[in-house]
Structures are given as structure tokens and as C-alpha cells.
């Protein structure tokens, strides 16, 4: 993951003593929260592994680079990092195993230099619709994200509100088009069963998109088509069983693109014999001599690569009559 | 057994400044966050600041910013709320209360209160 | 800033009779997965003290003849049978956004 790093440029720590020492005076803009380490030199705040339950609110206005990593902060209300001065310097923020099962609309609305977001590892049981639009307006102000990563962002099968978890996530992507500038995307281990069909029409700029480690069955409804600047496409650990005519060809169309589809349970069956193909010419397919069937059991194991259309059969189907019980 | 046990209160002057503490006891102090919540006569509830557990997050009722100073000292367990500029409208009884390190679920343990006078 | 509306203002009930305080936010104070909003009972010279969290769940030592109810921006305290030391002021209070606010106060009394 593309997670912000900062430079190894010598930290300020807010020492303890520090808010008791200065408590009768409103804190100076540019000092260091309580809890968080600084540099200025690196415009860089750690405010990491120190079970938080808030955003710091005097956060200095030099910081362009935020770790809030490992907190336990629940909810992300709107405006969580709006402040007088804006931040207008944030550019990175990482938010991820910080406890968050709420992240409300708004929530990062007046960061207007935010191009890398990280909320992985949080149970997002609630991720409001606008959450990343700011407004409910059918077309929203762009958003200046570039890179959104959203790895395990699932909650417990018991926090999930009886609602499709996908939808949520695909409704808080598509609000308001406001991440039309959205280079990557990164979805992975979210047991995904399916992905929305107009999620991706709807992201035209995407360099990088990883949906793997879900449960993906299927792309047969997935288009990739507007799909034109995408880079790479990861697909591993999924449940996907074959790749249709129409996916091939999309794919195949995509001028840049490497797609890595290691770790799926293949059938090898008669449904197969186009992706053989497909794959035997292609170029785009990242380790494709790794790719081992799984399904019928007489094939597992058999590489992809290898086989030819008398391997890939389907077993006739009876007529009623004759079919044991 | 928690403990909230406030101090400082008394009878100022507009314009004067008074300093309010509150001793906790019977739980981990630094794991809390902390507000201050005001009644005036005859009157209801108003929350008045709050402060996190690291002291990294405040907040203020916007009748106090710029006023008000919230802080705390977690090695004496101690939270403190600076007054200045006081006004007739800041007379009240103070409360200090306690919130789980999650805000969501309510105040749960409050102080007897210390009572304000602001009068010239 | 959220506005709490309760009412009554003030109730007088015979004890064993059930009562009910409504508690009216501004705007939702709830999301999907839960209610930011609180009950307090403050009894004469006393302080507040915490009765209900997150709409429904009963503070540890209240007595369950209390209950919360409600989500969104409408909230209900009840007692379902009330008790002489259950006379006092109820608050209501949302901790959806920063200012925390209260409602205005119900006054219970007994008949």
C-alpha cells in the first residue's frame, strides 16, 4: 500500500509536561499536540499507537504529511480537520487501525491539498455517502484525492446492518463525482462478493485498482472499457472461476494495463477454453505461468497454460430420465 | 470508588480571572477525557469545554472561546479550567465530568460542583 | 449548533403510575449503527447523574424501571413505574458534534 512516509529528520516530541506548563495560554500555531511527535523540517505529525480518541485539534499548519495510525478514535465527524487557518498544507494522511466505525459526511472536507488517503484496518460500518463528496449535490466540488486506500475495511458479520457492504462502499466512491481524479484505488480484503457495475465507468482517471484478497466470483458485469489509463489490476486471492469473452477483450484493449490473477480457484471446464486461449497470447497477465486449475478435481493443479481444448471438457448433461437421484 | 472533587470557586469581579480545579480519584485518570459543564441559577445545563485524555483535543462552548482555558496534569490527576474576563453571565455551579475515552457514551461520573459568583 | 427540545417542562405523577419525558433534536443525532444521545437525572442539590447512554443502554446501578428509546432526532425516557426518589429534573443531551447541548429540563414531582 501507498501509504504517506516521512523522512527520518529529527522529531519533536510534545513532552508531558508541556500542556500543564502552558495552561492558562491558548496553544502557539505551530506547536506540536500533545501525544504526537513533529518535524518541521519534514512537515511531517506521528500521532501514532496512542489510543486517541479525537483528531488533535492543534494540529500546526506547517504539517503535510499526518499519521494518526493506531488509535481508537470511533468516529470521524464532518469537519474533523477543518481548522482556522485550513490545513492547507495536508497532502497525506493515514488513518488506518485506528478503530473508526464511522466516518460521517463531510469528514474531510477543507483539506484542500489531501491527494493521499489511508483508512485501512478500520471496521467501517458506517461510511456515510459523502464522506469523501462533503455534500449531498448530485455533482460535488472535485476532490483533490489521488490515492484512496480502503484495504480491510470491513466490519464484523455482526456490525454489517443487514445492508451490502459493497453498495455502501460504492455509494461514498461515486457521491457527487467527486473522485474523477482518483489515480488508485485500493480495495483489497474487504470480502467483496461483487463488485457494482458502474463503479469503474465512473473512475476514468484510475492508474491502479486492487481488489484482491475479496470474494469475487465474477466479472462478467464489470466493464473496464473507460478503463483507458489503468496500470495495473490485482485480482489475486479472489474466487474468480473463468474470465468471459467480454472481460478478455476489455482487458485486452487497455493499452498500459498488467493484471495479476494468481490465487483463484480456475474451473477447467469447456467454459475455459476462450481464457486458454486468451492467456497464451496475451502479455498482460503478470505471472500467468502460475496459474493452476482448481476445479473439476481431475484437473487440479493442471497449469493454465498447458492445456489444450481436449483437456477442457464438460460433462454432458442427462436428460432427467436417465439422471440418478 | 470514582471521585470528582472541584475547588477554586468564589465571588470575582467582572473582568477578573478565577482558576477552577478538580481532584480525581478511584480511576485511571489519563485514560479519560474530561469537561467542565456549568448551571446557572434556577437554570439547566451547559456544557462549557472539554478536554482528551493526552490533552491533544479541546473544545470550547463558543460563550467561553477565547476566555476559558482548559487543561489537565495527568501525574496529579488533576483537571483545571482557567477563567478570564469573567462576566455576570459566566455565574454558574461548575461541574466537572467525566466521558469513557469513547465520547459517544455519555458523562458518567460527575463532581459536587463549586459555584462561581460573578459580581461587582 | 443542535437545539434540544424536551417536554413536559414538568410532570406531576402518583407513585406506581408510569411517565414519559420526550427529548427532540434540531437534527439527527444518530447514524446508522448508533444514537449519540443521553438521559440525566439531578436530583435537588445534587449533581447530574448519568441514567441512559446511547439512547437505550441503562447506566450500571439505575434501576430498570427506566428505559430510552428512539433514534434520528426523536428520544424517550421512561419510567415505568415511578418511585418518590425519582423526583428531580431530567436532562436530556446529545454528544453528536461539538457544543455538547441539553435539553431545558423536565421537572418530575410526585402527586
Known amino acids: 500500500s501507498s501509504s504517506p512516509t516521512s523522512s527520518a529528520s529529527s522529531f519533536s516530541s510534545s513532552a508531558p509536561f508541556l500542556a500543564s506548563a502552558v495552561s492558562a495560554q491558548p496553544p502557539l500555531p505551530d506547536q506540536c499536540p500533545a501525544l504526537c511527535e513533529c518535524s518541521e523540517a519534514a512537515r511531517t505529525v506521528k500521532c501514532v499507537n496512542r489510543n486517541l480518541t479525537e483528531v488533535p485539534t492543534d494540529l500546526p499548519a506547517y504539517v503535510r504529511n499526518l499519521f494518526l495510525t493506531g488509535n481508537q478514535l470511533a468516529v470521524l465527524p464532518a469537519g474533523a480537520f477543518a481548522r482556522r487557518p485550513p490545513l492547507a498544507e495536508l497532502a497525506a494522511l493515514n488513518l488506518s487501525g485506528s478503530r473508526l466505525d464511522e466516518v460521517r459526511a463531510g469528514a474531510f472536507e477543507h483539506l484542500p491539498s489531501l491527494r493521499q488517503l489511508d483508512l485501512s484496518h478500520n471496521p467501517l460500518a458506517d461510511l456515510s455517502p459523502f464522506a469523501f463528496s462533503g455534500s449531498n449535490a448530485s455533482v460535488s466540488a472535485p476532490s483533490p484525492l489521488v490515492e484512496l486506500i480502503l484495504n480491510h475495511i470491513v466490519p464484523p458479520e455482526d456490525e454489517r446492518q443487514n445492508r451490502s457492504f459493497e453498495g455502501m462502499v460504492v455509494a461514498a466512491l461515486l457521491a457527487g463525482r467527486a473522485l474523477q481524479g482518483l489515480r488508485r484505488l485500493e480495495l483489497a480484503s474487504n470480502h467483496f462478493l461483487y463488485l457494482p457495475r458502474d463503479v469503474l465507468a465512473q473512475l476514468p482517471s484510475l492508474r491502479h485498482l486492487d481488489l484482491s484478497n475479496n470474494s469475487l466470483v465474477s466479472l462478467t458485469y464489470v466493464s473496464f472499457r473507460n478503463l483507458t489509463h489503468l496500470e495495473s489490476l490485482h485480482l489475486e486471492d479472489n474466487a474468480l472461476k473463468v474470465l468471459h469473452n467480454g472481460t478478455l477483450a476489455e482487458l485486452q484493449g487497455l493499452p498500459h494495463i498488467r493484471v495479476f490473477l494468481d490465487n483463484n480457484p480456475w474451473v477447467c471446464d469447456c467454459h475455459m477454453a476462450d481464457m486458454v486461449t486468451w492467456l497464451k497470447e496475451t502479455e498482460v497477465v503478470q505471472g500467468k505461468d502460475r496459474l493452476t486449475c482448481a476445479y473439476p478435481e481431475k484437473m487440479r493443479n493442471r497449469v493454465l497454460l498447458e492445456l489444450n481444448s481436449a483437456d477442457l471438457d464438460c460433462d454432458p448433461i442427462l436428460p432427467p430420465s436417465l439422471q440418478t437421484s | 470508588e470514582v471521585q470528582l472533587v472541584e475547588s477554586g470557586g468564589g465571588v470575582v469581579q467582572p473582568g477578573r480571572s478565577l482558576r477552577l480545579s478538580c481532584a480525581a480519584s478511584?480511576?485511571?485518570?489519563?485514560?479519560?477525557?474530561m469537561h467542565w459543564v456549568r448551571q446557572a441559577p434556577g437554570k439547566g445545563l451547559e456544557w462549557v469545554a472539554y478536554?482528551?485524555?493526552?490533552?491533544?483535543?479541546?473544545y470550547y462552548a463558543d460563550a467561553v472561546k477565547g476566555r476559558f482555558t482548559i487543561s489537565r496534569d495527568n501525574s496529579k490527576n488533576t483537571l483545571y479550567l482557567q477563567m478570564n474576563s469573567l462576566r455576570a453571565e459566566d455565574t454558574a455551579v461548575y461541574y466537572c465530568?467525566?466521558?469513557?475515552?469513547?465520547?459517544?457514551?455519555?458523562?458518567?461520573?460527575w463532581g459536587q460542583g463549586t459555584t462561581v459568583t460573578v459580581s461587582s | 449548533d443542535i437545539v434540544m427540545t424536551q417536554t413536559p417542562l414538568s410532570l406531576s405523577v402518583t407513585p406506581g403510575q408510569p411517565a414519559s419525558i420526550s427529548c427532540r433534536a434540531s437534527q439527527s443525532v444518530s447514524s446508522s449503527t448508533f444514537s449519540y444521545m443521553h438521559w440525566y437525572q439531578q436530583k435537588p442539590g445534587q449533581p447530574p447523574q448519568l441514567l441512559i447512554k446511547s439512547s437505550s443502554n441503562l447506566e450500571s446501578g439505575v434501576p430498570d424501571r427506566f428505559s430510552g428509546s428512539g433514534s434520528g432526532t426523536d428520544f424517550t425516557l421512561k419510567i415505568s413505574r415511578v418511585e418518590a426518589e425519582d423526583v428531580g429534573v431530567y436532562y436530556c443531551?446529545?454528544?453528536?458534534?461539538?457544543?455538547?447541548?441539553f435539553g431545558g429540563g423536565t421537572k418530575v414531582e410526585i402527586k
Open positions: 478511584g480511576f485511571t485518570f489519563s485514560n479519560f477525557g
Open positions: 443531551q446529545h454528544s453528536w458534534e461539538i457544543p455538547y447541548t
Open positions: 465530568a467525566r466521558s469513557p475515552a469513547y465520547y459517544r457514551y455519555g458523562l458518567d461520573y
Open positions: 478536554i482528551s485524555s493526552g490533552s491533544s483535543t479541546f
